[in-house]
C-alpha cells in the first residue's frame, strides 16, 4: 500500500483546512491508527491528533477544539483531519504517520499555506485644483499573504507607482495614482482594484474625483441692445460661469449703488420697467473657495423718442 496526500494544502484565514492522508491499501488491509504532527524545520515535532480505530480521535491540548474529523463519508483507510479556523501561525509542515495491519507503518508530509486576504484602504490625496502640475489623486494600500496585487481602473489619464513592504508573515502593497488635474476629471471614478488568491473576486474601492476650478465669467442679456429701451419690462442680465465647488454670485454697479427695484436672484439681475436711471456699468462677481472672477457690462437704456427724433433729423439733413 501507499499513502496519498497533497504536497501543499492552501486555505484562507479563518477557514477549515482539510489535511489529507489516505492509505491506499491492498484488500484486507486495515488502518489501526493515524498520528498527525507538526514538523517545522528546526523545531521538534508537535503532536496534533491521534486517530485510533478503537480509541477514537485524541486531540493534543494545544489543538483542543480545533482538530476534528471531516464530515462523512469517511473511509476506514482515510486518516484525514480538519484543522478548524486556520490562522497564520498554522502555516508550516505537517506529517501523518499511518500504522496499518499487516503492512506496517507509512508516513507522508504536506505543507499548509494560509492565505490572508487583504482589507484594502483608499486614501484620497490633497485637494485637486485646476492648474496644478502632477498631483497625487489617491493612494491604495492592501496587506495580505501572499502580497496582493494593486491596480487602478479609470478613464482618467494618469500615472501609477507602487511600493511594497515585507512583514514577517505578510506584505503590504501601496499604489499611488498621480494626475494633472483638469475640470473634465470632475465626477470621474478612480477605482483601486485589489487581487489576491484568497479572494473569490477582486476587491474594488471607488473614489470620485473632485477638481476645484472656476471658469471665466460672462454676462448674457445684452445681445440685442435695441431691447434695452425705456419702459421695457422683464429685462434681465444673467452671469455665466461654472466651478467646483459650485460658485456664488454677487452683483454690483460700478458707478453707484444698484438702482431701486433692481432685484438680485443668484446669478440673475432682474430689472423693473427700464428707465434711463438703469443705464450704467454692472459687475458680476463670481467666487468659490478656489478662486474668483469678475465680468462687467455697460447697460445703455435707449429713449425711443430721442432715437426717432435723431432719425428725423438725419432724414431732414439729407
Amino acid at each position: 500500500g501507499e499513502l496519498e496526500t497533497s504536497d501543499v494544502v492552501t486555505v484562507v484565514l479563518g477557514q477549515d483546512a482539510k489535511l489529507p492522508c489516505f492509505y491506499r491499501g491492498d484488500s484486507g488491509e486495515q488502518v489501526g491508527q493515524v498520528a498527525w504532527a507538526r514538523v517545522d524545520a528546526g523545531e521538534g515535532a508537535q503532536e496534533l491528533a491521534l486517530l485510533h480505530s478503537k480509541y477514537g480521535l485524541h486531540v493534543s491540548p494545544a489543538y483542543e477544539g480545533r482538530v476534528e474529523q471531516p464530515p462523512p463519508p469517511r473511509n476506514p483507510l482515510d486518516g484525514s483531519v480538519l484543522l478548524r479556523n486556520a490562522v497564520q501561525a498554522d502555516e508550516g509542515e505537517y506529517e501523518c504517520r499511518v500504522s496499518t495491519f499487516p503492512a506496517g507503518s507509512f508516513q507522508a508530509r504536506l505543507r499548509l499555506r494560509v492565505l490572508v486576504p487583504p482589507l484594502p484602504s483608499l486614501n484620497p490625496g490633497p485637494a485637486l485644483e485646476e492648474g496644478q502640475g502632477l498631483t497625487l489623486a489617491a493612494s491604495c494600500t492592501a496587506e495580505g499573504s501572499p502580497a496582493p496585487s494593486v491596480t487602478w481602473d479609470t478613464e482618467v489619464k494618469g500615472t501609477t507607482s507602487s511600493r511594497s513592504f515585507k512583514h514577517s508573515r505578510s506584505a503590504a502593497v501601496t499604489s499611488e495614482f498621480h494626475l494633472v488635474p483638469s475640470r473634465s476629471m470632475n465626477g470621474q471614478p478612480l477605482t483601486c482594484v485589489v487581487s489576491h488568491p484568497g479572494l473569490l473576486q477582486d476587491q474594488r474601492i471607488t473614489h470620485i474625483l473632485h477638481v476645484s476650478f472656476l471658469a471665466e465669467a460672462s454676462v448674457r442679456g445684452l445681445e440685442d441692445q435695441n431691447l434695452w429701451h425705456i419702459g421695457r419690462e422683464g429685462a434681465m442680465l444673467k452671469c455665466l460661469s461654472e466651478g467646483q465647488p459650485p460658485p456664488s454670485y454677487n452683483w454690483t454697479r460700478l458707478d453707484g449703488p444698484l438702482p431701486s427695484g433692481v432685484r438680485v436672484d443668484g446669478d440673475t439681475l432682474g430689472f423693473p420697467p427700464l428707465t434711463t436711471e438703469h443705464s450704467g456699468i454692472y459687475v458680476c462677481h463670481v467666487s468659490n473657495e478656489f478662486s474668483s472672477r469678475d465680468s462687467q457690462v455697460t447697460v445703455d437704456v435707449l429713449d425711443p423718442q430721442e432715437d426717432s427724433g435723431k432719425q428725423v433729423d438725419l432724414v431732414s439733413a439729407s
Partner: antibody, heavy 119, light 107 residues
Framework: EVQLVESGGGLVKPGGSLRLSCAAS????????MNWVRQAPGKGLEWVSS????????YYADSVRGRFTISRDNAKNSLYLQMNSLRAEDTAVYYC????????????WGQGTLVTVSS | DIQLTQSPSFLSASVGDRVTITCRAS??????LAWYQQKPGKAPKLLIY???TLQSGVPSRFSGSGSGTEFTLTISSLQPEDFATYYC?????????FGQGTKVEIK
Amino acid sequence: EVQLVESGGGLVKPGGSLRLSCAASGFNLNHYNMNWVRQAPGKGLEWVSSVSSGGGFRYYADSVRGRFTISRDNAKNSLYLQMNSLRAEDTAVYYCARGAVFHDAFDIWGQGTLVTVSS
Amino acid sequence: DIQLTQSPSFLSASVGDRVTITCRASQDISSYLAWYQQKPGKAPKLLIYVASTLQSGVPSRFSGSGSGTEFTLTISSLQPEDFATYYCQQINSYPFTFGQGTKVEIK
C-alpha cells in the same frame, strides 16, 4: 466497560421542553462524534442529530431543526439534547450512539430513554 | 436526502436457513452503508460497516456486500438468536438515514 446511559425522558405536554442527557463511561467522549437516534413506538429508527468530536459541527434532521439543540460537555463526558416546542410526533425512545472513528457507523448505543408528548 | 428501501419488510425463516436482506439507496452512496440488528426492547447493535466489514465480536455467519445503490446482508445459517429486526443505514452524508427495517421471524 464501555457504555452510554441516557436520562431525562418523561411525559411532557405539547409545546413543552425536555433535556435529555447521555453519560459516557469506559471511554473518552471527546474522542468521538456523537449522535441521537429515536424510535417511535412500533416504528423504525430515525436519525435525529449529530455533533462532531470537538463540538464544532452540528447536524439535524429536518423534522427537528430549529426545535432541538445537540450539545456536549467533554469535561463531564456527557452529551445532551435540548428539545423545545415538543409535538405528539416526537414521542419515541431516544438513544444516544457513538460514531466510530474512520467510518461513522454507530458502534456503541445507550439503552434509550422514553419521551412521551401528550396532553 | 438519501432514501433507503429495505426488502422484504417481513421474512419468515427456519433455523439453518440462508437469509438475504436487500437495501436500495435512492442515490449512489459508494460503500458507506452499515447494518444493525435490534431485538425487542433493546438498543440496536452494529453488525457491519462500510458495506462489508464485520464489526468486532459479530459472528462470521453475517456478511455484507454491495456498493453504489444496491446492498445485501446475508446470514449464512440462521441461528435462534438471529430472530430480530435488521436495519440498514447510510453514512455517506448528513442527514444520516435508516431503512424501514426487515423483521426476521421464526417460521
